[in-house]
């Protein structure tokens, strides 16, 4: 009996540019002889319904149809037919099929590969055209994929023990697609600093499928001047 097992749940998520290993394990009732078996990996794009051969291994012959694709013969002996793809790109997401032949038996398994890119986040202060005591803080999130993203603003006042979500005076622009397929978006918070308590911490909170925990960028209102420090104006921080 020949059986193939892929990633549990049927989906693998990998960061953009990562060296990804797409799992495929072979279960066979006898010891595997790699000279008399075959492995073929196929890929089906998210946009086209056409299957493309990525890699094949037959006895003493192996060929990568995608540059850098490899199945380790050494690991194959112990039943690991996982495919390694260096520098994975967004357009390489889709369905991967691992087909194993141990004559006369054949088994296969499929897995969905999702490629994600984590956003970078930075805060900027824009005082151009603003009234006195009015500031506009911009939270720029860039280089993320997929497009779905959630940006919120929160504040933590001195006296209260937990943050408060801000819903007023927040405008989040449309997402903009970059040349590389990733996305950018900017969210703006308008503050009347004269009405806010010094010591209040404001935070732009970015939630995205690529992040285990939200990305946070903050600034604190000071009594002297309600603004970001010079380093905060230009640096990325989370």
């Amino acid at each position: 009996d020949l059986k193939v097992e892929m990633m549990a749940g049927g989906t693998q998520i990998t960061p953009l540019n990562d060296n990804v290993t797409i799992f495929c394990n072979i279960f066979y009732s006898q010891p595997l002889n790699i000279t008399s078996m075959g492995i073929t990996w196929f890929w089906k794009s998210l946009t086209f319904d056409k299957e493309v051969k990525v890699f094949e291994f037959f006895g003493d012959h192996q060929e990568a149809f995608r540059p850098g694709a490899i199945v380790s013969p050494w690991r194959l002996k112990s039943g690991d037919a996982s495919l390694r793809l260096p520098g994975i790109q967004l357009e390489e997401a889709g369905e991967y099929r691992c087909e194993v032949v141990v004559t006369p038996l054949k088994a296969q398994g499929t897995v969905q590969l999702e490629v994600v890119a984590s956003p970078a986040s930075r805060l900027l202060l824009d005082q151009v055209g603003m009234k006195e005591n009015e500031d506009k803080y911009m939270c720029e999130s860039s280089g993320f994929y997929p497009e779905a993203i959630n940006i919120t603003w929160e504040k933590q006042t001195q006296k209260f023990p937990h943050p408060i979500e801000i819903s007023e005076d927040v405008i989040t622009g449309p997402t903009i697609k970059n040349m590389d397929g990733t996305f950018n978006v900017t969210s703006c918070l308008k503050l009347n600093s004269s009405q806010e308590d010094p010591g209040t911490v404001y935070q732009c909170v970015v939630r995205h499928a690529s992040l285990h925990t939200p990305l946070r960028s903050n600034f604190t209102l000071t009594a002297a001047r309600h603004s970001l420090s010079e380093t905060e104006k230009t640096d990325n921080f989370s």
Epitope: E154, Q156, Q158, F160, P161, H162, P163, G199, V201
Partner: antibody, heavy 117, light 107 residues
Framework: QVQLVQSGAEVKKPGASVKVSCKAS????????MNWMKQAPGQGLEWMGG????????DYNEKFKGRVTMTVDTSTSTVYMELSSLRSEDTAVYYC??????????WGQGTLVTVSS | DIQMTQSPSSLSASVGDRVTITCKAS??????VAWYQQKPGKAPKSLIY???NRYDGVPSRFSGSGSGTDFTLTISSLQPEDFTTYYC?????????FGAGTKLEIK
């Protein structure tokens, strides 16, 4: 990292006073507000009051007003909560706590005050 | 003062169960509600703020929902370490007030 270390357990007689301390470290002391909570044995949590750590502002729960005093010693980064005219229902664990800047609020380990004749 | 009425006061469940604890505020508190977990002899630990936002490091099995006067804390799949006491807290105004607590026990 932020630490709030409270003074040890106290046993007091009814009518006496108790002063519990909370020493803070790991952050700029004066730029925060410190709250005090009470938790009687097997009971829920109750806010007693709070103090701004530069010492210029306090806010007390009406229930404890007149009996509770909160003070600050900025030189030692220590906050004090004094409760006077103690009665048996004041037997509780007292906690100092401050906001956590997005990572959950910070709490001291608690101080058990037992009021018994 | 704003009263926070928490229910049930105790709850028996098994590992893997999904449980929901509710909290009702005596007046509109918006989303200014936090949830705490307290283990015996320890200080409370914040789980949720702004009714539904998990603090960093809090397992995803904990989720909060609600706004206005009705709030819930849900634990999607109970783990052995979750059997302890939970409190809700409003922080829209002083005095800060808490629910009376829900003790979660192993069935």
């Amino acid at each position: 990292q932020v630490q709030l270390v409270q003074s040890g357990a106290e046993v007091k007689k009814p009518g006496a006073s108790v002063k519990v301390s909370c020493k803070a470290s790991g952050y700029t002391f004066t730029s925060y507000w410190m709250n005090w909570m009470k938790q009687a044995p097997g009971q829920g949590l109750e806010w007693m009051g709070g103090i701004y750590l530069n010492g210029d502002s306090t806010d007390y729960n009406e229930k404890f007003k007149g009996r509770v005093t909160m003070t600050v010693d900025t030189s030692t980064s220590t906050v004090y909560m004094e409760l006077s005219s103690l009665r048996s229902e004041d037997t509780a664990v007292y906690y100092c706590t401050r906001r956590g800047d997005y990572f959950g609020d910070f709490w001291g380990q608690g101080t058990l005050v037992t009021v018994s004749s | 003062d704003i009263q926070m009425t928490q229910s049930p006061s105790s709850l028996s469940a098994s590992v893997g169960d999904r449980v929901t604890i509710t909290c009702k505020a005596s007046q509109n508190v918006g989303k200014y509600v936090a949830w705490y977990q307290q283990k015996p002899g320890k200080a409370p630990k914040s789980l949720i703020y702004s009714a539904s936002n998990r603090y960093d490091g809090v397992p995803s099995r904990f989720s909060g929902s609600g706004s206005g006067t009705d709030f819930t804390l849900t634990i999607s799949s109970l783990q052995p370490e979750d059997f302890t006491t939970y409190y809700c807290q409003q922080y829209i105004s002083y005095p800060l007030t808490f629910g009376a607590g829900t003790k979660l026990e192993i069935k």
